[in-house]
Structures are given as C-alpha cells and as structure tokens.
Interface confidence: low
C-alpha cells in the first residue's frame, strides 16, 4: 500500500494473507470462502493445498494467526493468464469453517443497490501487506482511502504504451489520485477494495486488487480493481454448487479450472 | 305306538372370555365390546403425541387376539409420550429449553439463537416444537437446523472498536 497508514485491530477483520509462490491477499466471505484475484493463485493451480492462508493478524510475520487451508480453488473461466486481467477473480474454498470474532469477520458482497456507494469520487479503502513507498513489503497491515476514478478517464490512462489497447474492461474499476501517491501495489493483489454501505452500516467488497502501472502511486495512473458486482451470480453459483460448509479436511485439494485455461509463461504484473 | 327316535345329546361349548382390555394411559381400545371371546381382537391407538411401545421397542401398530385359553396373545403396550430427544447442537449458536430444563417431549419448545454480534440466524426464527412424528420442527415446518450465518462487514473503523 502506497501512501497509507497502519491498520488497527478489528479495522479489516476480513483481511486474509495468502502465501504461495508470492505474497498476496484475499477477503473472507462467509466463514469458509476467500475471495481473491485469479492471478494471485494461478501459479498454485497444480497444488492448491500448498496455499498457506492466514487470518486474524495484523503483522505479516507474526506467529499468532489463524491458519486455514484450501480445499479447492475456483478460477473464473473467462480469466486468461497471458492476455490481460479481464475476469481476474477467484474463490478459495477453505477445508474448515473459521470461528468468527472481532479479528476475523467476513466482508459483505455488494447488494444490488451498492452501485450508489461506488460512484466516481466515492471513497473506497484498500488494505494489504504489499510494497510501500519505501520499497519493502509492509510488516504491519496497511490501508489507504482512495476515490473511485471515472471509468473513461481510467481507460484513457491505460490506452497509451506500454499498455495494450483495451486493457481496462467493463469488468474493472479504477481508484486513486490523479496526483498519485496513494495506491495499492505488488503484494496487495487479491485484497479487497471496500466501501461502506451507509444504509446498513456494513462494509462490502467493491473491488479486488488486480493490476496497475509499472510504478505504484504514479501520477496520472490508477490502481485497477476487479469489479465485484459484475460477478455476484458467478460467486453465488459456486458457493451454492460447492457447498457452504467446509468438509473438515481429508482428500487432496482441488484446483477447479475446467474452463479453457491456457498454460503460459508467467508475466510478472505488479499487483 | 311310541316312536323310537333315540337319544339327543346337546353339546355346548363356552369359549373363555378374555380379560377386558384396559387401555393404557393416553391410549384407547378399538373396537370396544362388552365381551371378547376366542378370535376376537382389539387394537390400541395412542393419542397424538404418544407412541406405542412394547418394552423398549416402538410398534407401528398393535392388535391382540383372544386365545382359546382366555388369554390375550400379546401384552398390553404402553402409549409413551413422543420424545424428540436432545436437540442437535447449532454451530456458532446455542439452544435454550423453553418448556422446562431438558424437556424434550411432545409439544416441548426450544429456542435456538446465534452467538451475538458475529452471527445472525437464517432460515427461520429459531423456535422449534417437538411434534408427534418425533422431530423438532420450526414454525415453518422445517425439520433441519436453522443456520447461524456470520455477520459480514463489521469493522472497528465504523463501530469504534468492539
């Protein structure tokens, strides 16, 4: 997180740390699912059980955390690893339910009315243990409040080289300051960009940290997030089809990618 | 001239009547007869909320037949109040006995509730009644447990810490 501040206990109780090949993040849904970015877990697709999932902690290196393990990983069938970041969304089913408390609480999915809290200039909050402006992964969970950017303005920002045309799709939303300085960064991938629903006084996930400019916090560029509201049917179908309840373990973890995933060389994108 | 018709011997047999069947508490006898003799039978039907038991064994139905020695061929069963048994534990919740401590018999009421703050009840209001079929049943007729679903989107940023 660039230009952010330290989170306090209970501020982001849905925050999940995912350790696999790299550091990434996710957000707890219900008590046995994690919402994350497809690119964050793609490398582990052949061994989903290798994902080390931690929650209930502020400190990235703390030994005090709640451990969870993956039973199955579901990558969106429209995500293609070597062709941009459209449909950069995945679900991890945990092999056990976690106990909910003030430090571990799920994030809400957006209601139909959520768009009214996610208009241009509405403030969302990104959190994570990713790179800070000092160039190191954060030891303490950090967060930053950033405004939503007009979609056309964001599309235009990424129309020029080195970004290929059409990088920003209708399945994405952008957030950040035109002047730069506040952004998500490498290592924050998969984490939630959350918004406060002022009617219910509950926080909901509007975006998933996905990608951005080569240099985090760069002026005139913005962080790009998967637009979660476009995927509510996909999320609900998977959760209903593959069960709300954790199985309690046993058996090998599955990586569900029954949808034309191309094996490709990994392009190192920063988020 | 006297007719020679010989002797007439009249045989009469009296079947032993069986003891009058007294219905067990919370049951009734059918059919009700003044007397039950050889091959007569009766059935016992329990009131709603009671089940037929022969010893420890539940019976689907009960019919006894009067035997020639004047005894019934089976013992009188009991009509025992249906017991739904202890309610299942509710993950992330608890159950309270409303009718009385540990009371799990017919028409007993229990109330499920979820752990405060972090869980909320889905499916129904959590009130279940022990019904005649031996199942705890919600006011909506569900026999499955309610669900304690985690409350989402709580944060110390808006609640000022918990």
């Amino acid at each position: 997180i660039y230009g952010g501040q330290k989170a306090k206990p209970g501020d982001f109780p849905w925050q999940v740390l995912i350790l696999g090949g790299t550091t990434a993040a996710g957000a707890l849904l219900y008590d046995n699912w994690v919402l994350t970015a497809a690119h964050a877990v793609y490398e582990q697709k052949h061994d989903a059980s290798a994902l080390d999932i931690r929650m209930g902690t502020l400190k990235r290196l703390s030994p005090h955390y709640t451990q969870a393990w993956s039973e199955a990983v579901f990558i969106h069938e429209g995500y293609t690893h070597d062709a941009g970041f459209d449909n950069d969304i995945a679900l991890i089913k945990l092999n056990n339910k976690v106990v909910i408390n003030s430090n571990i609480t799920p994030i809400c999915l957006p209601r139909k009315e959520a768009e009214s809290f996610m208009r241009t200039d509405d403030i969302g909050t990104a959190s994570g243990w990713g790179l800070t402006q000092r160039g190191f992964l954060a030891r303490n969970l950090m967060y930053v409040d950033i405004p939503i950017v007009d979609h056309q303005k964001c599309t235009a920002a990424y129309e020029k080289p080195p970004y290929p045309r059409g990088s920003v799709t209708a399945n994405m939303l952008c957030a950040g300051l035109e002047s730069g300085g506040k952004d998500s960064c490498r290592g924050d991938s998969g984490g939630a960009l959350v918004f406060l629903d002022s009617e219910t006084e509950r926080w909901f996930v509007g975006g998933i940290v996905s990608w951005g400019s080569m240099n985090c916090g760069e002026a005139g560029q913005y962080g790009v997030y998967t637009k979660v509201i476009n995927y509510i049917p996909w999320i609900e179908n998977i959760i209903s089809d593959f069960g709300g309840g954790g199985s309690g373990g046993g058996g090998s973890a599955k990586f569900v990618a029954a949808w034309t995933l191309k094996a490709a060389a990994h392009h190192h994108h920063h988020h | 001239m006297a007719s020679m018709t010989g002797w007439k011997i009249h045989y009469t047999s009296t079947a032993h009547a069986c003891p009058y069947p007294m219905a067990p508490p919370n049951g009734h006898v059918s059919p009700v007869q003044a007397k039950y003799i050889l091959k007569d039978s009766f059935s016992i039907f329990c009131e709603t909320g009671y089940e037929l038991l022969q010893g420890h064994l539940p019976l689907k139905s009960f019919t006894a037949v009067c035997q020639k020695d004047g005894s019934w061929d089976r013992p009188m069963p009991a009509c025992s109040i249906v017991d739904c048994g202890p309610p299942d534990d509710l993950p992330s919740g608890r159950v309270e006995y409303i009718t009385g401590p540990g009371v799990t018999t017919y028409k007993a009421v229990i109330q499920y509730s979820c752990e405060e703050t972090f869980y909320t009840m889905k499916v129904n209001d959590g009130k279940y009644v022990c019904e005649a079929d031996g199942f705890w049943t919600s006011s909506k007729g569900e026999k499955s447990l309610p669900v304690c679903e985690p409350v989402c989107g709580l944060s110390a940023r808006t609640t000022g810490g918990r």
Epitope: - | P24, P25, L53, Q54, G55, H56, L57, S71, W72, D73, R74, P75, M76, P77, A78
Partner: antibody, heavy 125, light 107 residues
C-alpha cells in the same frame, strides 16, 4: 424352576477388564429381555444395562456407556457383561436379571422378576 | 434421569403392625413403579409391579398404590420375615432408576 447363575467376578485393578457370565435355565430364555443390575457394598440397587430378547438393541446407564457391553447367546441360554476400563466406583455385586417376558400381561417391560444370587466385582489397586 | 426418593430411610415397627412405605418420583411416571424386597445376603425379590399389580407367589398382605409422582407400598400386618430393605424402581424412562431404599426393622 427359574435359575440364573452369575460367574466371572473377582478382584481387578483400575483400568482392567472382566467378563461376567450368566447361565439361565428353567424358562424360555429367548422370550425375555435380560438385564444386569448392580449393588455397591452397603448401597442401593443400580440398573446397569439391558438387552432385548432377540439381541437387537442394548441400553446402558450413562456412567458405563462405552466401557461396558451387554450381549447374549440365545443358543447357549447365556447373558454376558464385558467390562473394560474398570473404575473403583464399579465395585459392586452384579446381578443378572430377567426383565419380564416379552409375551406377558402388562403395559411395559422394565421390572426385574427373576434374579441370580450375584457375583462380586472388586476394582482396587 | 428420574430420581426416586424413598421415605422414611428406616421404619421401626413390630410384627402385626401395618407398614406404609413411600416413594416419590422427581417427575410423573404414570404407574410405572415396581417394588422389591431384599434381605441381607440375598438378591432382591419383586413384590408389586405397575404400582399396584400383585405378583404370583407374593403374600396378599403386600399391596401398592399411587400414580404420577407419589407411591405407597403397604404391608397390612407385618410378619417376622418381612423385616428387610424395600426398594422402588421406575420404568417410565428406559434409564431405569431405583430409590435409595427403606429399611424396615423390628422395633
């Protein structure tokens, strides 16, 4: 004449095991539910376990569940009680008893009409 | 479990007298109460079943009454051989329980 003769009692250390037997005669064994009832020295009676006439179901008091197993062999007119993980509080005279005939007058079985003379089980180190 | 409480714990009477023994259940047990007699060094003996039903071979001086929660065993005229410990037992619940016993002793 109904006869029930228990055997298999004795001294055993805590945590140990014993198998009690009850040989039945003088009645149609497979018409009767059978039970074990115990009596600690100087104390009252305590029902331990029941097995139905055909062996289809067993019932236990809570304190012996998982440790004791009641069984029967109708061909041998015999009742058994396998006692594992014995505790000092299991010390008692164990009586074998019939639990009223399956085909008999009455509402409900559950009274003990014939009793053996008992066998003493002592659990002590 | 259903708790049976017998009273008195000890009853001192003389032969020829009438003995009244009480058994109270912690909840209603209908008429599912049975009475036993036990003499020192002997196994118990069934006296009365289902609160008031007589048992073949048991002298007529033994009788029982009651239903619900309160039950009584009555010995109309005590004989010397009647001095023993008496237990009630319930079968309303399949987790059978006995009372703690009443000792009937010679005065």
């Amino acid at each position: 004449e109904v006869q029930l003769v228990e055997s298999g009692g004795g001294l055993v250390q805590p945590g140990g095991s014993l198998r009690l037997s009850c040989a039945a005669s003088g009645f149609t064994f497979n018409d009767y539910n059978m039970a074990w009832v115990r009596q600690a020295p100087g104390k009252g009676l305590e029902w331990v376990a029941t097995i139905l006439f055909d062996g289809s179901r067993t019932y236990y008091r809570d304190s012996v569940k998982g440790r004791f197993t009641i069984s029967r062999d109708n061909a041998k007119n015999s009742l058994y009680l396998q006692m594992n993980s014995l505790r000092a509080e299991d010390t008692a005279v164990y009586y074998c008893s019939t639990e009223s005939p399956y085909y008999s007058e009455g509402y409900y079985q559950g009274y003990f009409d014939y009793w053996g003379q008992g066998t003493l089980v002592t659990v002590s180190s | 479990e259903i708790v049976l409480t017998q009273s008195p714990a000890t009853l001192s009477l003389s032969p020829g007298e009438r003995a009244t023994l009480s058994c109270r259940a912690s909840q209603s047990v209908s008429t599912s109460i049975h009475w036993y007699q036990q003499k020192p060094g002997q196994a118990p003996r069934l006296l009365i079943k289902y609160a008031s039903r007589s048992i073949s071979g048991i002298p007529a001086r033994f009788s029982g009454s009651g239903s619900g929660t309160d039950f009584t065993l009555t010995i109309s005229s005590l004989e010397p051989e009647d001095f023993a410990v008496y237990y009630c037992q319930q079968s309303y619940s399949s987790l059978y329980t006995f009372g703690q016993g009443t000792k009937l002793e010679i005065k």
